[in-house]
């Protein structure tokens, strides 16, 4: 399981209309459920239940975003509408270029994502936990535009990281 180097750029607008960018780095793991590829796009937080909706119109998600899903404790969702892998698949079907799962509260999901699939997704499925997950969710929960860049080798230039 290779390390996924995730670079998140946050766009902070000022009243004058200018914006400042803040870049932060974190690491996750590429799961066997998806491809070990670089990917990028705007971060879109998705609730696990939001991926249950199979309404055709809802499936017309735009192309080119990175889905972030915080998985809940299994006890809170004893009969999920989809497996974790199914949720990743649904996000990619809706146009995600990559999916990042925060597995901090559901570490069992790691095994589910790493079970050798005969038909892995063609897009990366990454999981994060611990301090990296906290860092990611802190960014996602801000009312700010954010983009993620996922790479399977460290970014070439040392990025100036800002504590989010």
């Amino acid at each position: 399981k290779e390390t996924a180097f995730v670079e998140v750029v946050l766009f902070e607008s000022s009243p004058s209309g200018d914006y400042t960018t803040y870049t932060t780095g974190l690491t996750g793991r590429f799961s066997r459920a998806g491809a070990t590829l670089s990917a990028e796009g705007e971060i879109v937080q998705m609730h696990p239940l939001g991926l249950c909706n199979n309404n055709d119109e809802e499936d017309l998600y735009e192309y080119g975003w990175v889905g972030v899903v915080k998985l809940e404790q299994p006890e809170l969702d004893p009969k999920p509408c989809l497996t974790v892998l199914g949720k990743a698949k649904r996000a990619v079907q809706r146009g995600a270029t990559a999916v990042i799962f925060d597995v901090s509260e559901n570490p069992e999901a790691i095994d589910q994502l790493n079970q050798g699939s005969e038909d892995p997704l063609k897009r990366p499925v990454v999981y994060v936990k611990g301090a990296d997950a906290i860092k990611l969710m802190n960014i996602v929960n801000k009312q700010k535009v954010a983009r993620a860049r996922i790479q399977h080798r460290p970014p070439r230039q040392p990025t100036e990281y800002f504590d989010m």
């Epitope: 766009f11 607008s13 670089s38 705007e42 879109v44 809802e58 146009g95 990559a98 990366p124 009312q143």
Partner: antibody, heavy 117, light 110 residues
Framework: EVQLVESGGGLVQPGKSLRLSCSAS????????LHWIRQAPGKGLDWLGY???????VYGDAVKGRVTISRDNAKNTLYLQLNSLKSEDTAIYYC???????????WGQGTLVTVSS | DIVLTQSPALAVSLGQRVTISCKAS??????????MHWYQQKPGQKPKLLIF???NLASGIPARFSGSGSGTDFTLTIDPVETDDIATYYC?????????FGSGSRLEIT
Amino acid sequence: EVQLVESGGGLVQPGKSLRLSCSASGFTFSNYGLHWIRQAPGKGLDWLGYSSSNSGTVYGDAVKGRVTISRDNAKNTLYLQLNSLKSEDTAIYYCARGYSSSPFAYWGQGTLVTVSS
Amino acid sequence: DIVLTQSPALAVSLGQRVTISCKASQNVDGFGIGYMHWYQQKPGQKPKLLIFAGSNLASGIPARFSGSGSGTDFTLTIDPVETDDIATYYCQQNKDFPLTFGSGSRLEIT
């Protein structure tokens, strides 16, 4: 069916402010990013700004400092507030759906704003 | 800002092949994602997405339209051209803020 309907256009005097609305239906509004784009008569397309699904905003250069984009997820509506209007702001104003890293997949029909004394 | 340069007007005969170019002032490729898109706008109508991410045909668009290119050079091809294609064609990038459009290429039939 995805629908975006802009309203609030019309004749406005220079120096005044205006607020345009974009009413959305046919999709879960709070899940999507939305943009404002304008087109002056006989001219090209000009991106004004973006509101992300979590209400983050980024603005374009054309109206920087005079514009505020906001959204009301409960009302399925996106807003554009434009201050200190000039004659150069005369244009058709469109809202369009798409994340900042996605194409503009759906467009409203536009609302015409004419700035003139 | 990323500037997109398009040729302003093109004249073509019906049934012919036409290519419309768009040159970006900076690389607009991303990791596993294309940041260049094409739109068609007919007189008095709203723009319509034709091609997304450089080469993907948008839903409901005829296969006469195709897109290609990478980096800074992109092309929209219509083959064969039909009367219904009389319109202005815009390229657009969203690699970086501010998002920008080309100035448009007007297609005329000779």
